[in-house]
Interface confidence: medium
């Protein structure tokens, strides 16, 4: 299964929105900001299975979606941007399950839960504990919607790796028919 | 109310297979992880697998990998346990468990529980 | 794998009395979010195990407030702080912290 080509173009579409959803300064913020610890290993690695890309961002994109749907964010945030973050979030999670299971189905196994799932919950529950001791202050979410830009683009960068991956295997697999 | 109902444990010979069930109710089955443990003779508790909402991802200890296939069919609201190559040391009350998820915290804690089903191996 | 340890029994004790029951990790439990992934099971007799504390220190729903826990991420603690007769049964440590999930051999509560 590839990617769907417009996966790409809603996780761009996905930052985009983020950056509109600014409402403060950061530079107003910068006494609250705090290190996550983004897993960075988990996007970096070079030997990458199609499975794990698309486990680590389908969980990434269900956690950011779960912390932008609560009763909290739509007090901090724009409601038409929200809807529209949730909107296309919602997109990119379909797509990627389509995807996984017939990933899966072709017995690549995703191996999801032992790496990507439990260490990005572990992850957005940082964030989580964070929103909570700010008091869910705008400083907070302005420190968090940065956080989540810097983490999507990490994870967006991994799956443009993989589509190039999967282009180089097409040609090289056309080199030797 | 929250409920897990248990079924298929059986006695089965060393090698054989057997299928456990667990139906829910009470709640949105799907959108909560779910788990079968296992409590051996001695009493202690021993985690089997554990299966997202979707069910799009699973995992084993290595005790039971490549033995037991954890699965759900979410429009019957049922959990499953296929066990196969079956050894005496999988003698135990198997119990299933829904994951804690509420709130958005995505926590593994197992917050309901069913009433357990026994399987016995021996020959 | 994450070994927990507990003793198998606690010591006796009476009703209406606070008792303690002790657990330990083979490594620390805190993770770098702030969060410890400590947890905390009952089986009262002839039933399935319940849910009492999670994350190290919070009470699941529907527990009574005489339950407390605390640690430092590998010393853990349970605490009744007025044992009543239906607070008999096995306790079990477990850890979330990684894969595979373990829990401890279990503790029984003895009443004098």
């Known amino acids: 299964c590839d990617l769907p080509q417009n996966h790409g173009l809603l996780s761009r579409n996905t930052l985009v929105l983020l950056h509109q959803m600014r409402r403060i300064s950061p530079f107003l913020c910068l006494k609250d900001r705090r290190d996550f610890r983004f897993p960075q290993e988990m996007v970096k690695g070079s030997q990458l299975q199609k499975a794990q890309v698309m486990s680590v961002l389908h969980e990434m994109l269900q956690q950011i979606f779960s912390l932008f749907h609560t009763e909290r964010s739509s007090a901090a945030w724009n409601m038409t941007l929200l809807d529209q973050l949730h909107t296309g979030l919602h997109q990119q999670l379909q797509h990627l399950e389509t995807c996984l299971l017939q990933v899966m189905g072709e017995g690549e196994s995703a191996g999801a839960i032992s790496s990507p799932a439990l260490t990005l919950r572990r992850y957005f529950q940082g964030i989580r504990v964070y929103l909570k001791e700010k008091k869910y202050s705008d400083c907070a979410w302005e420190v968090v919607r940065m956080e989540i830009m810097k983490s999507l683009f990490l994870s967006t960068n991994m799956q443009e790796r993989l589509r190039s991956k999967d282009r180089d295997l097409g040609s090289s697999r056309n080199d030797s028919h | 109310e929250v409920q897990l109902q248990q079924s298929g444990g059986d006695l089965v010979k060393p090698g054989g297979s057997l299928k456990l069930s667990c139906a829910a109710s009470g709640f949105t089955f799907s959108s909560y992880g779910m788990s079968w443990v296992r409590q051996t003779p001695d009493k202690r508790l021993d985690w089997v697998s554990i299966?997202?909402?979707?069910?799009?991802?699973?995992y084993y200890p290595d005790s039971v990998k490549g033995r037991f296939t954890i699965s759900r069919d979410n429009a019957k609201n049922t959990l499953y346990l296929q066990m196969s190559s079956l050894k005496s040391e999988d003698t135990a009350m198997y119990y299933c468990?829904?994951?804690?998820?509420?709130?958005?915290?995505?926590?593994?804690?197992?917050?309901?529980w069913g009433q357990g089903t026994s399987v016995t191996v021996s020959s | 794998d994450i070994v927990m340890t507990q003793a198998a029994f606690s010591n006796p004790v009476t009703l209406g009395t606070s008792a303690s029951i002790s657990c330990r990790s083979s490594?620390?439990?805190?993770?770098?979010?702030?969060?410890?992934?400590l947890y905390w099971y009952l089986q009262k007799p002839g039933q399935s195990p319940q849910l009492l504390i999670y994350q190290m220190s919070n009470l699941a729903s529907g527990v009574p407030d005489r339950f407390s826990s605390s640690g430092s991420g590998i010393d853990f603690t349970l605490r009744i702080s007025r044992v009543e007769a239906e607070d008999v049964g096995a306790y079990y440590c477990?850890?979330?912290?990684?894969?595979?999930?373990?829990f401890g051999s279990g503790t029984k509560l003895e009443i004098k």
């Open positions: 468990a829904r994951h804690a998820e509420g709130g958005g915290n995505y926590d593994y804690a197992m917050d309901y």
């Open positions: 477990a850890q979330n912290l990684e894969l595979p999930f373990t």
């Open positions: 299966i997202t909402s979707g069910g799009s991802y699973t």
């Open positions: 490594k620390s439990l805190l993770h770098s979010n702030g969060i410890t992934y």
